[in-house]
């Protein structure tokens, strides 16, 4: 039965003499005469078990004292730890010449463990041990004792186990304490590593290669490695284990997040608080749930706060100049924390008498610079119909509106467009020509722009060229021309007039009177 | 058993020589050294000195020099203390001892009865 | 030579009593010493030596403690027999004995 001794931990002890109770039994030649199992007290009053001799007085002095069969558990170099006490023969009187001051320490390696006998011959000497000035002055209880301590260590061993063995050559000695120990680069965690326990190698220069195992929540960056050292202590890490995502280091493992923290990635980070406007519910996050209202767009870090859509443009102006209007805007004051804000357009064509029956305005409508995507604060718009409502709603937008598109975000103006003259006439006839008159008949404009208040029709002969022209007002979308010459070519224009002034001229219309009476209904092509 | 044997009391007159046996039995004579001790009457314990019985080297304490004789024949396992030129002073028990070395300290483990020499003219 | 003086020269005691018994060094000392009973008309007895070791025999109702300069033998509990002359002996090169200590029935 063995008490319960602290050691280093890259020691793990094979045989110790101070943790045995009772008595040792050791094995001693001759059986009498020689090393003694004697009981000394501790400062517990406690006993120790030692084993002295004193035999100085008789010269070639050969006692011997073997262990129990101690196993090697596979420690391929043990060291033996011996604390001892060594009278001075000088503090014995008389004995000169047969006192020595040293004694000498053997092993033998064997399979068996229930050897009875010691066979000198069979033992190979490890060393001679001398008591050295470094010994301590150790207390028992209010009793001073000397205490020497020597380690020595043996190697490489191949078999089960082994015997050691001390021989007195004539020394007043008593054996205090036998320690036999291996040493190992005891179970460690570096880098985020496990390195399992490892037994030192055979020889004292020796290094052993192990590999480390990621801890829990980790996995590798690069092959973590390590060598044991034959004095076991760890040396040269190579590699690392990083902790996941949603774990960090701690104490050389890998704990969760704690709620309200969160880790992305695997890498050597430490957990971070969740960005504004964000949280988590459960350890070990990776991300951080957005706030209800708070979003987060699909090209955004993790580490990045939640944002919102903006809140509406501010000071938003109108100005109208005929069928154009420029728009400008302010700002939103809450850019819902983003730089990525831009503004869309929309634009709505409403009914003079329900001005809540509107519908897009179409593809008609251009603008300047642009109608989505605006960076900057001001917009032109241009060929609108005159005398028109039309609301412009400026949409603030940013990386996250698409999520919770809302009508807070926009701001809208309601405008209606001013007289303008009247687009040109697209098609004239002549639908009756004569040999002194034309009947003309053509369409309204495609963009009265107002109330058309007449048409004005321009004619003139062809050879005359424009020189010397005619005018004649109706306000209906026909008229006959009369007191033309026979067999002479006219070419005719007609323009609308509205309270905004004339529209563009119509392309000309060339028709050549006829010598006899006859009907021609011409189709805006040349009659003749 | 381990023991030691001394010879009865000696009665001698001043100037005269004595030599005091102490036979051992139980153990090897040699492993251990003998020790003297003498005892005056009513007085305490004097120690004389020892000797090596294994090399017969003596070792003799302050003021028991001179006068003072230890020997051996290892052959009858015996150590002898011979006192020369006896004075009134030497009148004492004189006990002979077998000494206990230990690393940790020494001591008589096994005494002989004594042998009480008187000096009387 | 190291000088060793005991005190008290007399100790009275009642069987059962526990008795303590000084051994004072002229110097310091690195071993402790021996203790011997002696009782009339007999040859001086080891009690005690080395550290604090019992003699063969030797019942531990005695036990000896101290060091430097300062020793002690103590009897738990005193038996009748126990009633005797007690020695200190300090051992190295010259072994010296202290003048001793009379132990009697109270």
């Known amino acids: 039965v063995t008490g319960s001794r602290v050691y280093p931990a890259n020691e793990v002890t094979l045989l110790d003499s101070r943790s045995v109770q009772g008595e040792l039994g050791w094995i001693a030649s001759p059986l009498e005469g020689g090393w003694e199992e004697v009981s000394i007290m501790d400062e517990k009053n406690t006993p120790i078990r030692t084993y002295q001799v004193c035999n100085v007085m008789e010269a070639s002095q050969n006692n011997w004292l073997r262990t129990d069969w101690i196993t090697r558990e596979g420690a391929q170099r043990v060291y033996i730890e011996i604390k001892f006490t060594l009278r001075d023969c000088n503090s014995l009187p008389g004995v000169m010449g047969t006192c020595k001051e040293t004694f000498n320490l053997y092993y033998y390696e064997s399979d068996n463990d229930k050897e009875r006998f010691i066979r000198e011959s069979q033992f190979g000497k490890i060393d001679t041990i001398a008591a050295d000035e470094s010994f301590t002055q150790v207390d028992i209880g209010d009793r001073i004792m000397k205490l020497n301590t020597e380690i020595r260590d043996v190697g490489p061993l191949s078999k089960k186990g082994f015997y050691l063995a001390f021989q007195d050559v004539g020394a007043c000695i008593a054996l205090v304490s036998v320690r036999v120990f291996y040493k190992k680069c005891p179970l460690t965690v570096r880098n985020l590593a496990q390195f399992p326990d490892t037994i030192t190698g055979a020889d004292t220069s020796s290094l052993v290669e192990v590999r480390g195992s990621c801890v829990n929540n980790s996995e590798e960056k690069d092959v973590p490695k390590m060598y044991c050292g034959a004095d076991g202590e760890w040396l040269v890490p190579i590699g690392n284990c990083l902790c996941n995502a949603g774990h960090e280091e701690q104490n050389g493992e890998c704990q969760a997040c704690k709620i309200g923290y969160y880790k992305a990635l695997s890498t050597d980070a430490s957990c971070a608080k969740c960005p504004p406007h964000s949280y988590s519910v459960w350890e070990g996050a990776t991300s951080c749930t957005c706030d209800r209202g708070f979003f987060r767009a699909d090209n955004d870090a993790a580490s990045m706060p939640c944002t919102r859509p903006p809140s509406a443009p501010l000071n938003l102006i109108s100005n109208v100049n005929e069928t154009s209007v420029n728009l400008e805007w302010s700002s939103p004051q809450n850019t819902g924390g983003r730089q990525d804000i831009s503004y869309n357009v929309v634009c709505k064509k409403c009914g003079a008498g329900d001005p809540s029956k509107c519908r897009p305005c179409g593809s008609g409508v251009h603008y300047t610079p642009q109608q989505n995507g605006l960076k900057t604060t001001r917009v032109s718009i241009t060929d609108l119909l005159a005398h028109t409502n039309y609301t412009f709603e400026i949409w603030a937008v940013n990386g996250v509106s698409k999520y919770n598109p809302s009508p807070d975000q926009s701001v809208s103006v309601t405008v209606t467009t001013n007289q303008a003259a009247p687009s040109s006439i697209a098609l004239v006839q002549a639908k009756e020509v004569t040999r002194y008159s034309v009947a003309l008949a053509w369409l309204e404009p495609d963009r009265p722009n107002g109330v058309i208040l007449e048409y004005e029709v321009k004619y003139y002969e062809k050879d005359q060229n424009e020189r010397s022209y005619r005018i004649v007002r109706t306000a209906a979308r026909n008229t006959d021309i009369k007191g033309l010459n026979p067999l002479t070519s006219y070419v005719f224009h007609v323009r609308a007039r509205t309270a905004a002034g004339y529209g563009d001229f119509s392309e000309p219309l060339e028709v050549t009177t006829n010598t006899v009476p006859s009907r021609i209904i011409g189709d805006g092509a040349n009659s003749t | 058993q381990v023991q030691l044997l001394q010879s009865g009391a000696e009665v001698k007159k001043p100037g005269a020589s004595v030599k005091v046996p102490c036979k051992a039995s139980g153990y090897t004579f040699t492993s251990r050294a003998m020790s003297w001790v003498r005892q005056a009457p009513g007085q305490g314990l004097e120690w004389m000195g020892w000797i090596n019985t294994n090399t017969g080297n003596p070792t003799y304490a302050q003021g028991f020099t001179g006068r003072f004789v230890f020997s051996l024949d290892t052959s009858v396992s015996t150590a002898y203390l011979q006192i020369s030129s006896l004075k009134a002073e030497d009148t004492a028990v004189y006990y002979c001892a077998r000494v206990r070395l230990t690393v940790y300290g020494d001591g008589m483990d096994v005494w002989g009865q004594g042998t009480l020499v008187t000096v009387s003219s | 030579e190291i000088v060793l003086t005991q005190s008290p020269a007399t100790l009275s005691v009642s069987p059962g009593e526990r008795a303590t018994l000084s051994c004072r060094a002229s110097q310091s000392v690195s071993s402790n010493p021996a203790w011997y009973q002696q009782k009339p008309g007999q040859a001086p007895r080891l009690l005690i030596y080395g550290l604090s070791t019992r003699a063969t025999g030797i019942p531990d109702r005695f036990s000896a403690s101290g060091s430097g300069t300062d020793f002690t033998l103590t009897i738990s509990r005193v038996e009748p027999e126990d009633f005797a002359v007690y020695y200190c002996?300090?051992?190295?090169?010259?072994?010296?004995f202290g003048q001793g200590t009379k132990v009697e029935i109270k």
């Open positions: 002996q300090q051992y190295g090169p010259s072994w010296t």
